[in-house]
């Protein structure tokens, strides 16, 4: 166990031309704060990936108001160190992200607004217990100067904080097999404290809290003998014993993740996915609340109603993530069809369509009718990503190949009889009715309920309407 410590020395304009404008003004006074995110190893990871080694926020710095006409000086900084506790071994190599945030203190509705001024990242090798390392990083026109170190928390010592030291029990020397603790020569290296309950006969550990089994033993505490019955294991019989070797305990056995974290195995070890409010390699670091200002990009922090959610960040438009740390990429919604390329322009989504497709979402197939003949004099109609045939009279179906029965829909009203005809259909009307579909009653006095006749036609002349 130990603590990573970060000391910010200055944040201000870098050397060279193009000095940045001051982030604060008389109208909009502001103050700075910093966030550090640590990850084990030297992997080039996205800013949004979890801070598996831990994260910390600084206090807010003094309020700063720009002096009119003056160039941006080094800005006033928060007091104190940023401290990131780690419970397990210090990895020796690590990646860091340090963010400089501005808190505007104008008359915003809904409290102060936060915005990211600068983000620097790096990958370093660092032994725990060593001196402060100094660093300078540039982000655009800004320059950040800082120092950092990793120190072990007693009783841990060593470059990885895995060796434990105890005061000497005898004044002259340490116990059998235990060396003096350098640089604390008056203390002795203590035996490693394995996982509680780890079998002293069949288990051992190379790091605190671990329990690794000798051959022939298994289980999270190495108390279960490997089966000596006939060997069902695909590995076959063990050469060392008469039984079978079953795989030893997996890295997630016994769930090393604290505080309700869920464990997943990785090629080298394990990874904990921590519930909100906890972080660290094993979700052991807790206590993030709204007072720590965990919501970025102007997110509004609301205290959670239960331990599962010590806080909830309500993100402004355009941001997401449990801390509003991710810019929403609306292309993640997969809005473009037919292989179109999505572009999130901020104010709008655009789909760049492949050849042969069109529409705001590339949903229209321009080649709907290409090579799609409609039979029997039908014409092809494009649209909706599928071609459609508008069929000539007397034909139907998808490609107008089916002969349609024009009488199937019973088009003749009032008991009229329908006859299929090469040009369509003919209705033979029942007595008292007339019209192409027998839709008009003929009144007994010879007048009919026909609409006003077109010029040159007498009302009640049924022949003229057939």
């Amino acid at each position: 166990a130990g603590v990573f410590e970060l000391q910010i020395h200055s944040f201000g304009p870098g050397p060279g031309p193009g000095a940045p404008r001051s982030p604060c003004s008389a109208r909009l006074p502001c103050r700075l704060f910093f966030r550090v995110c640590l990850k084990p190893g030297l992997s080039e990871e996205a800013a949004e990936s979890p801070c598996a080694l831990g994260a910390a926020l600084s206090a807010r710095g003094p309020v700063y108001t720009e002096q009119p006409g003056a160039p941006a000086p080094d800005l006033p900084l928060p007091d104190g160190l940023l401290q990131v506790p780690f419970r397990d071994a210090w990895p020796g190599t690590f990646s860091f992200i340090i963010e400089t945030w501005r808190e505007e203190l104008g008359d915003q509705i809904g409290g102060p607004a936060w915005s990211l001024l600068a983000r620097v990242a790096g990958r370093r090798r660092l032994a725990a217990g060593g001196p402060w390392a100094r660093d300078i990083q540039r982000a655009g026109a800004w320059e950040l100067r800082f120092s950092y170190r990793a120190r072990c928390e007693p009783p841990a010592v060593g470059t990885a904080c895995t060796r434990l030291c105890r005061p000497r029990s005898a004044p002259s020397r340490c116990g059998p097999g235990l060396r003096p603790c350098a640089p604390l020569e008056d203390e002795c290296e203590a035996p490693l404290v394995c996982r509680a309950g780890c079998s002293p006969e069949h288990g051992f550990c190379e790091q605190p809290g671990e329990c690794r089994c000798l051959e022939g033993w298994t289980g999270p505490l190495c108390t279960v003998p490997v089966s000596t019955s006939s060997c069902l294991s695909p590995r076959g019989p063990s050469s060392a014993t008469t039984g079978c070797l079953v795989p030893g305990p997996g890295p997630c056995d016994g769930n090393p993740c604290a505080n309700g974290g869920s464990c997943s195995e990785t090629p080298r070890s394990f990874e904990c996915t921590c519930p909100r409010g906890f972080y660290g390699l094993r979700c052991e670091v807790s206590g993030v609340t709204c007072a720590d200002g965990p919501c970025f990009n102007g997110g509004l922090c609301v205290g959670g109603a239960d331990p599962d959610s010590a806080y909830i960040c309500h993100c402004p438009p355009g941001f997401q993530g449990s801390n509003c740390e991710k810019r929403v990429d609306r292309c993640s919604l997969q809005p473009c069809r037919n292989g179109g390329l999505c572009l999130d322009l901020g104010h709008a989504l655009r789909c760049r369509c492949r050849a042969g497709f069109a529409g705001p979402r590339c949903e229209h197939d321009l080649d709907d009718c290409a090579g799609r003949a409609c039979a029997n004099g039908g014409t092809c109609v494009e649209g909706g990503g599928a071609h459609r045939c508008s069929c000539a009279l007397g034909f139907g179906g998808r490609d107008c190949r089916e002969r349609a029965d024009p009488c199937a829909a019973r088009p003749c009203a009032h008991g009229g009889r329908c006859y299929a005809h090469f040009s369509g259909l003919v209705c033979a009307c029942a007595p008292g009715y007339m019209g192409a579909r027998c839709e008009f009653p003929v009144h007994p006095d010879g007048a009919s309920a026909l609409p006003a006749a077109p010029p040159g036609l007498r009302p009640g002349d049924p022949q003229r309407y057939l």
Partner: antibody
Framework: QIQLVQSGPELKKPGETVKISCKAS????????MHWVKQAPGKGLKWMGW????????GYADDFKGRFAFSLETSASTAYLQINNLKNEDTATYFC??????????WGQGTSVTVSS | DIQMTQTTSSLSASLGDRVTISCRAS??????LNWYQQKPDGTVKLLIY???RLHSGVPSRFSGSGSGTDYSLTISNLELEDIATYFC?????????FGGGTKLEIK
Amino acid sequence: QIQLVQSGPELKKPGETVKISCKASGYTFTDYSMHWVKQAPGKGLKWMGWINTETGEPGYADDFKGRFAFSLETSASTAYLQINNLKNEDTATYFCARYDGYAMDYWGQGTSVTVSS
Amino acid sequence: DIQMTQTTSSLSASLGDRVTISCRASQDISNYLNWYQQKPDGTVKLLIYHTSRLHSGVPSRFSGSGSGTDYSLTISNLELEDIATYFCQQGDMLPWTFGGGTKLEIK
């Protein structure tokens, strides 16, 4: 034809975990994002968020951050919704729905989750 | 978040009637307005997308119109199978939001 088939109803106790599945068929699963919608008894529809079926990246509406997790089994064309540490107010019907660029064009039949001690 | 308001929570009409259901957004949603139908058995179907486009397989008696903040769904000739609850939804800005629903009943 396009279908989204969800797993059956669930009866759970507070504090337990539930995992609902949504199996897609009739289209290329990784071409369309999958969305989840909650409907409490007698109430309207509430959008929970989505998962990008190509990358597996989820996005959550504010009210569904923390205890809710969207995931995929791409080889089985299946999306999942997991709710941890269930509470009485999680009692609802949960729908999965495909997004076509304009709207959620096809919906699952819904999975009823009842949380009761 | 954009609020979607369906002022009429329930509506009675006769078969064959022309029925209009309205929906109002708290800000301009640039025609990214969709209408869904939820049948009494709980199944949900898309009817209209992008204000006025008819989803495939939806009868032509359904139509949509509107712009800016005010939108409406019209059923030109009410049929028995149209008995359902209708929801509007905006797809302009995340998070997507739904109206409270309008339950359509037969007189």
